[in-house]
């Protein structure tokens, strides 16, 4: 980070507390661009040996308000004939993200930071672990 | 989310720009339990069969300032075998996230939302749907 | 400016199937689900169900499982309905609407000019 | 689902009125939205998050209540509010929608 030399108006570095009341502009910038979101499938979670769905997590308390999270849809993999294949499983591949979520008995705009674990798809797995060859 | 009427120390909700200026405590809470993230297995890179690499991307001008992004290993998914398999595709599992980057000229504390698309796994697609029977 | 397309009027047989379009301009299509939305003058307006362009996500009303399917083509910012095995129940004006992903307080904010179904033998 | 529940149905008012009408719900909800709609064109977000004016909204409407209890007001009812508004919620699935309230200029 390029530390800028402080002035009065910004928040001292060196005080225990800087990261407790920083300034953001939540308007969203769109930095991809919209050829790389439109080529990003959204029907791998059908076509997937392991596919899943997605459920609709809202909380308005929350930045981003809406999230979607996937479900494995099996416990095991879709073999090639469409059948459940026995000696793999499907698993749940997660992600752990920041959202911002309204601080209680504060202003609206006022949040904090926090974690939360988000399914994102799902994946084949067998119980050894083997490399191709 | 209880909106609380509005005082004079709160942001305007009805100002056109309220969302270009609100406050956050980048104090990260861990809401999740310890046992979640104990239990998040990191091995599916290895045992899928689409297995991944791992990369690491920093930014000393973002927050988080360290990001780590998946690639598949293959074009293809590894059979039983340990081949690759011709008939089956390894694709990367992608997810819009949200940070906060550092706002140029600006001081080191203030922040705007950015997307960022990063890829968290790959999973093995066929060419057409299938579902289980 | 913001604008909901939505596809014409539709006359359609009772037990075929039918899909409406509604394509999106002025703003970044993903940054905002497309929820749909029907009236009737007897049973007032009612919510279909929601479907997220971005993950491809879909949430249906119950009673709307199985009767229509919501999907969205992010290369052309344009959402649609399938709505199968028509009765004459499903006559009505239909609407997509959207909603912002990040900050839900905004609620349905731009709703598109909606779509005349009248299913009849 | 919740069920809103709007009163009046059909109402009346003359220029300069203050006008009021209700919705109530049969669960406790964090947020009341209402929609405008006038015949023939589809609805225009009205108030939103139960006090919100949306864009371009006359400052005589105002929105308020809490939990199950909501309520829509006209300050001076002009010609130009004559309309159906219809509140919604989106606290519980599935979403809802009051009946709506028809407000006609006397």
């Known amino acids: 980070a390029v530390l800028i030399p402080q002035s009065s108006v910004c928040p001292n570095a060196e005080a225990n507390n800087f990261l407790q009341n920083v300034k953001v502009n939540l308007k969203v910038i769109n930095s991809l661009s919209s050829k790389a979101s439109s080529r990003r499938p959204s029907d791998y979670l059908n076509r997937s040996t392991s596919p899943w769905t997605l459920s609709r997590n809202e909380d308005p308390d929350r930045y981003p308000s809406v999230i979607w999270e996937a479900q494995c849809r099996h416990q095991r993999c879709v073999n090639a004939e469409g059948k459940l294949d026995h000696h793999m499983n499907s698993v749940l591949i997660q992600q752990e993200i920041l959202v911002l979520k309204r601080e209680p008995e504060k202003c609206p705009f006022t949040f904090r930071v926090e974690k939360m674990l988000v399914g994102v798809g799902c994946t084949c797995v067998s119980s050894i672990v083997r490399h191709a060859s | 989310a209880v909106l609380i009427p509005q005082s004079s120390v709160c942001p305007n909700a009805e100002a056109n720009n309220f969302l270009q200026n609100v406050k956050v405590n980048l104090k990260v809470i861990n809401s999740l339990s310890s046992k979640a993230s104990s239990r998040r297995p990191s091995d599916y890179l290895n045992r899928s069969t689409s297995p991944w690499t791992l990369s690491r991307n920093e930014d000393p001008d973002r927050y988080p300032s360290v990001i780590w992004e998946a690639q598949c290993r293959h074009q293809r998914c590894v059979n039983a075998e340990g081949k690759l398999d011709h008939h089956m595709n390894s694709v990367l599992i992608q997810q819009e996230i949200l940070v906060l980057k550092r706002e140029p000229e600006k001081c080191p504390f203030t922040f705007r939302v950015e997307k960022m698309l990063v890829g968290v796994g790959c999973t093995c697609v066929s060419s057409i749907v299938r579902h289980a029977s | 400016q913001v604008q909901l397309q939505q596809s014409g009027a539709e006359l359609v047989r009772p037990g075929t199937s039918v899909t409406l379009s509604c394509k999106a301009s002025?703003?970044?299509?993903?940054?905002?689900?497309i929820h749909w939305v029907k009236q009737t003058p007897v049973h007032g307006l009612e919510w279909i169900g929601v479907?997220?362009?971005?993950?491809?996500?879909?949430f249906y009303n119950q009673k709307f499982d199985g009767k229509a399917e919501l999907t969205a083509d992010k290369s052309s910012s344009t959402a649609y309905m399938e709505l199968r095995s028509l009765t004459s129940e499903d006559s009505g004006v239909y609407y997509c609407?959207?909603?912002?992903?990040?900050?839900?307080?905004?609620?349905?904010?731009?709703w598109g000019q909606g779509t005349s179904i009248t299913v009849s033998s | 689902q919740i069920v809103l529940t709007q009163s009046p149905a059909i109402m009346s008012a003359s220029p300069g009125e203050k006008v009021t009408m209700t919705c109530s719900a049969s669960s406790s909800i964090s947020y009341i939205y209402w929609f405008q709609q006038k015949p023939g064109t589809s609805p225009k977000r009205w108030i939103y998050a139960t006090f919100e004016l949306a864009s371009g909204v006359p400052a005589r409407f105002s929105g308020s209540g809490s939990g199950t209890s909501y309520s829509l007001t006209i300050s001076s009812m002009e010609a130009e509010d004559a309309a159906t508004y219809y509140c919604?919620?989106?606290?519980?699935?599935?979403?809802?929608f009051g009946g709506g309230s028809k407000l006609e200029i006397k």
């Open positions: 919604h919620q989106r606290s519980s699935y599935p979403w809802t």
């Open positions: 609407t959207r909603y912002y992903r990040y900050e839900s307080f905004y609620g349905m904010d731009y």
């Open positions: 479907n997220d362009p971005e993950s491809g996500g879909t």
């Open positions: 002025g703003y970044i299509f993903t940054d905002y689900e």
